[in-house]
Every structure is written in structure tokens, then in C-alpha cells.
């Protein structure tokens, strides 16, 4: 028999959590034992399960883990896990701080999309990563020609929306495009919005003619470029 | 014709409670979320409140936080304003301004669009 | 919050002279998309205002090309080439980055 101890110690040592509101925060205490310990948690020292969190919890006995996604002031405290077995228990306390913002217009990750080479046939996937402290809304967007022009007289580009979504803030949104022909070679947008603002990035996909598979025969279908 | 037309304002005692509406017309008002403004007598512009297209979201400043609410009504393409516990200090011209749309933005994304405002005066 | 600081209070100008009205905020307006996202405004007497100026440097449909606006991240400037009677009003820039968004105090223009 063996009292609980901590399996990682060292995914332990940062003990002041200060995230965005909105953020998700995830605490571990992986441990182990003879009996294997239960873990229970605790917020400001009183047993917590979160029926009075919106959004709730969740707890992943077997990753030793606690996470609250889309964390608010009222979420700071103290949080304690606790691990028991019937030999002995350790504890180990995190502090959270609950950083507030100003909501702002959707940021963009830097460099998604990103221009990429693909050759006819293949599939291709476009990312667009979104952080957004109100939810989002997300347009993906081809750039087209139109009598032989890609700009109105208003001096505005025409667009075709390919995708429509709704997504929750920090996911990532993916255009798929199956089957790629030289008529997908162009510019395409992410555009994403939300109550304060919109917010888009644009990228370049390049078709290339199917390859002669006598000297290709090891070359990648897709090829990704910055 | 891209128009916002407010009403409801008035004279109102301090701690009393007022109601504006913006009636928007010649656009997708569903599309589009939607902001309040005001201006107090020979003052600058303040930001008051906005409101998602959907009404998910709104955001307060924190000079009408708790007091204030906005809302919406897509079926009938109507913004609200209801204040509450009004002072003094919210004496000022309302205005009802067009925010961001859900599409490309053929131009700015919003902000680009007022009403004519309406008055409200608190005053005891 | 971020504060928007504008410079002159007050502008008396020539008419078919050129006038400059400066605005400083308290944060980067520079957002990751590239664009700078400062709006500019005119009111004139009785009326709500009316945008001139969106994103930094593009004119809004309808506005004279005697309008331009510039800078970068902090600073930014309203020009007029040349003064006309009808520019008489107040002035305000707006960060429209983040809530609360927040104007400038304004520029009142005015005609020698």
C-alpha cells in the first residue's frame, strides 16, 4: 500500500492561473497511489462542483483534471485538489484570476489562412482561427470575376459566400474543398463578426495541373505555403 | 432610403423611467447590430450601448451599467433603449446608430448610419 | 478604456486654406487584420454626425476628396486641403476597436 503522491509535479508548478474572462482554464493533479485515490476539488476551501457556475464544469477523474470553460470574475478564488486514499492525502492549491477585457472586434490568428499550392484533384482545408469575446459569426468568402472585372464600380471586390457558420469563440473554422479544379484557383476570405465588429483575412489557393505520375510518385498531394 | 428614425423622448424627474425606440427602414435590419449614442447639451459624443444582430449579445457603458437595456425586435425592425433610474447626467440627445453587418462590408462596418436622435431631459 | 485626445479645441480658417485637426488615443488602434480603426465624423449645427473618414484613411461615399485622413497605431490626422464654408462644425475622431467605443472631445471649425 502507498500513500497518494504527484505523478507530475512538474505540470504543477504554475500555481497563479491569470487568464482572459472568457478563456478556458484547465487544473491538473495527476497522482497515483496504492489503493488508486479518488480527487476531489475544492474552491475557497468548500467542496466544489460547480452547480452554480454557468456553463458548469467538468471533471476528468482519470486525467485528474478540472476545466471551466469561458471563465468570469466570479470564478476567481482559491481551487484545491484534493487526493485521498485510505492510506494518507496530499492537496495542492491553484489561485485563478479572472483578467477582465473590453470586448473587442474579432482578432485573427496571423497567417491563416494561408496561401497554399495544391494540385488538380487533391482536397484542400483553409483554417481560420478566431478569438472573440462576443460569439462570432464566421463568412468564408471566394473573390470572383464578373464580365471580366474582380471589382465593382464602386470599387468594391465581388465576393461569393461559400460558408456560413456560427462557431464559440477560440475554435477553429475549416473550408473544406474537395476535388480541387483550376476554376477553385483563387483569393479567399475569412471573414469574421461580431457585435463590435467584422474582421477578415484572405488567402491565395494555386492549382497546379495534375502532375505526371511517372516522376511524381513520392511528391505530396497538397502542398502548403506561407 | 437607409433610414433610423428614434422617438420616445421627453421630460423626465430623476429615478424615473423612460422607454426609446429607433424604427430602422431601406436596409436588412436582422443583418445588422445596432448601437445607442448620446450627446449631452454642447457636449461631445458618448457610446451608450450595442446589441448584436440576433440580440445575443449587448455591451453597457459603464456610466448606464445596470440602469440601461437594450433590446430588439427584428420582426418589426425596432431598437430599444429602456432607462431606468434616470439622473440628471443622462440628460442628452439619443442616438440610434447601424453597427456592423454579417456580410462583406462594402465599406465601413458600421457607424455609418445615424438617426436624427430624440431628447430626453431629466430634471426635477 | 481607451481615450481618444484630439487637438486644437477650436480651428478658425481661411476659406480655400488647409486645415489639420490631430487625435491621439491611449492604445493601438491597429488591429491584427492590418486595418487601424479610427473613424472620423463631422456634426454640423442641428444635425447628428456624418462620417467622413473610415479605417484610418478611406472616405466615406459621397465625401469631397478634399477630406483625407492618415496615421498610424496612436496618432492620427484629419486634413481638409481646402476650406470651404460648408466644413463649419465639429470635428470627431472614434475608436471603433473595442467597447466602450470612445470619441474624441472635438474640433470646433470655424471660418475667418
Known amino acids: 500500500q502507498q500513500a497518494p503522491y504527484w505523478t507530475h509535479p512538474q505540470r504543477m508548478e504554475k500555481k497563479l492561473h491569470a487568464v482572459p474572462a472568457g478563456n478556458t482554464v484547465k487544473f491538473r493533479c495527476p497522482a497515483a497511489g496504492n489503493p488508486t485515490p479518488t480527487i476531489r476539488w475544492l474552491k475557497d476551501g468548500q467542496a466544489f462542483h460547480g452547480e452554480n457556475r454557468i456553463g458548469g464544469i467538468r471533471l476528468r477523474h482519470q486525467h485528474w483534471s478540472l476545466v471551466m470553460e469561458s471563465v468570469v470574475p466570479s470564478d476567481r478564488g482559491t481551487y484545491t485538489c484534493l487526493v485521498e486514499n485510505a492510506v494518507g492525502s496530499i492537496r495542492y492549491n491553484y489561485l485563478l484570476d479572472v483578467l477582465e477585457r473590453s470586448p473587442h472586434r474579432p482578432i485573427l490568428q496571423a497567417g491563416l489562412p494561408a496561401n497554399t499550392t495544391a494540385v488538380v484533384g487533391s482536397d484542400v482545408e483553409l483554417l481560420c482561427k478566431v478569438y472573440s469575446d462576443a460569439q462570432p459569426h464566421i463568412q468564408w468568402l471566394k473573390h470572383i470575376v464578373i464580365n471580366g472585372s474582380s471589382f465593382g464600380a464602386d470599387g468594391f471586390p465581388y465576393v461569393q459566400v461559400l460558408k456560413t457558420a456560427d462557431i464559440n469563440s477560440s475554435e477553429v473554422e475549416v473550408l473544406y474543398l474537395r476535388n480541387v479544379s483550376a476554376e477553385d484557383a483563387g483569393e479567399y476570405t475569412c471573414l469574421a463578426g461580431n457585435s463590435i465588429g467584422l474582421s477578415y483575412q484572405s488567402a491565395w489557393l494555386t492549382v497546379l495541373p495534375e502532375e505526371d505520375p511517372t516522376w511524381t510518385a513520392a511528391a505530396p498531394e497538397a502542398r502548403y505555403t506561407d | 432610403e437607409v433610414q433610423l428614425l428614434e422617438s420616445g423622448g421627453g421630460v423626465v424627474q430623476p429615478g424615473r423611467s423612460l422607454r426609446l425606440s429607433c424604427a430602422a427602414s431601406g436596409f436588412t435590419f436582422s443583418s445588422y447590430a445596432m448601437h445607442w449614442v448620446r450627446q449631452a447639451p454642447g457636449k461631445g459624443l458618448e457610446w451608450v450601448a450595442v446589441i448584436s444582430y440576433d440580440g445575443s449579445n449587448k455591451y453597457y457603458a459603464d456610466s448606464v451599467k445596470g440602469r440601461f437595456t437594450i433590446s430588439r425586435d427584428n420582426s418589426k425592425n425596432t431598437l430599444s433603449l429602456q432607462m431606468n433610474s434616470l439622473r440628471v447626467e443622462d440628460t442628452a440627445i439619443y442616438y440610434c446608430v447601424r453597427g456592423a453587418g454579417r456580410g462583406f462590408p462594402y465599406g465601413p462596418d458600421g457607424f455609418d448610419i445615424w438617426g436624427q436622435g430624440t431628447m430626453v431631459t431629466v430634471s426635477s | 478604456d481607451i481615450v481618444m485626445t484630439q487637438t486644437p479645441l477650436s480651428l478658425s480658417v481661411t476659406p480655400g486654406q488647409p486645415a489639420s485637426i490631430s487625435c491621439r488615443s491611449s492604445r493601438s488602434l491597429l488591429h491584427s487584420d492590418g486595418k487601424t480603426y479610427v473613424y472620423w465624423y463631422v456634426q454640423k449645427s442641428g444635425q447628428p454626425p456624418q462620417l467622413l473618414i473610415y479605417e484610418l484613411s478611406n472616405r466615406f461615399s459621397g465625401v469631397p476628396d478634399r477630406f483625407s485622413g492618415s496615421g498610424s497605431r496612436t496618432d492620427f490626422t484629419l486634413k481638409i486641403s481646402r476650406v470651404e464654408a460648408e466644413d463649419v462644425g465639429v470635428y470627431y475622431c472614434?475608436?471603433?476597436?473595442?467597447?466602450?467605443?470612445?470619441f474624441g472631445g472635438g474640433t470646433k471649425v470655424e471660418i475667418k
Open positions: 472614434m475608436q471603433y476597436i473595442e467597447v466602450p467605443l470612445t
